[in-house]
């Protein structure tokens, strides 16, 4: 759910930490009407997830993490 | 030690609705996701959806949107299911599962399920 | 939705044997695959998560492997008690889908 670079929507599926190699914040107050989590996957797709809901912290959490490391 | 216990056999007619509970022990209720699986009669396992009791959030599988609903009560640490518009497709053993990511998103604790006959 | 299919659907053995049950997704889910065991009138019990870790207190005899699309889920030495349904889970993505289960059954 996105247009011009902007997630308009969340999904309301549940993503795998396998299945996203990164991810982009979106911030409202930067050009863009919500907050969002914008997960890249495997399959090259974006997808828009609410930065509120508890999986998708626990991915942020874990993606950060793993950049720390390196 | 985790346990879910969840409420006993039900027999519905065709078109009522049943609530079914699953109440957790043994654990931070908040810290896991519980879903909903259902078996039918000699069929597999089908995946009904999920709820997060920190927040409430649900997301659900297609077939089952706007037959199952899924709520929580963390006073008592208890999900509950509600199925509506019952019909005879509808007669299973329904679990309730916790679901965590820390085993790779696993259905790591089972309830001992709760039978369900839809019958006229 | 990810399709899962499990092969074979049933299948006789013996005790001691050495059992080999498969399940391939419809795409890749990048080993976000889960094993369950279910024995009649029980709840379902977590076997492998990760496609190869062995679920706390599950005996060493059970194994997973596999990745991709194809996975495998081995019994080194059957035991009377592995007498059961197997099933596969892909958890890469919701909806969460089941393969529709191997019965094992004593030859």
């Known amino acids: 759910a996105s247009n011009f670079d902007c997630c308009l929507g969340y999904t309301d599926r549940i993503l795998h930490p396998k299945f996203i190699v990164g991810f982009t914040r979106q911030l409202a107050n930067e050009g863009c009407d919500i907050n969002a989590i914008i997960f890249h996957t495997k399959k090259k797709l974006s997808v828009c997830a609410n930065p509120k809901q508890t999986w998708v912290k626990y991915i942020v959490r874990l993606l950060s993490k793993k950049v720390k490391n390196m | 030690q985790v346990q879910l216990v969840q409420s006993g056999a039900e027999v519905k007619k065709p078109g009522a609705s049943v609530k079914v509970s699953c109440k957790a022990s043994?654990?931070?209720?908040?810290?896991?996701?519980m879903h909903w699986v259902k078996q039918a009669p000699g069929q597999g396992l089908e995946w009904i959806g999920v709820i997060d009791p920190s927040d409430s959030y649900t997301t659900y599988n297609q077939k089952f949107k706007g037959k199952a609903t899924m709520t929580r009560d963390t006073s008592t640490s208890t999900v509950y299911m509600e199925l509506s518009s019952l019909r005879s497709e509808d007669t299973a053993v329904y679990y309730c599962t916790r679901g965590n990511y820390g085993v790779d998103y696993a259905m790591d604790y089972w309830g001992q399920g709760t039978s369900v006959t839809v019958s006229s | 939705d990810i399709q899962m299919t499990q092969s074979p659907s049933s299948l006789s053995a013996s005790v001691g044997d050495r059992v080999t049950i498969t399940c391939g997704a419809s795409?890749?889910?990048?080993?976000?695959l889960n094993w369950y065991q279910r024995k009649p009138g029980k709840a379902p019990k977590l076997l492998i998560y990760?496609?190869?870790n062995l679920a706390d207190g599950v005996p060493s005899r059970f194994s997973g492997s596999g990745s991709g699309r194809d996975y495998t889920l081995t019994i080194s030495s059957l035991q009377p008690e592995d007498f059961a349904t197997y099933y596969c889970q892909n958890v890469l993505i919701t909806p969460y889908t089941f393969g529709q289960g191997t019965k094992l059954e004593i030859k």
């Open positions: 795409e890749n889910i990048y080993g976000a």
């Open positions: 043994g654990y931070t209720f908040t810290n896991y996701w």
């Open positions: 990760g496609a190869t």
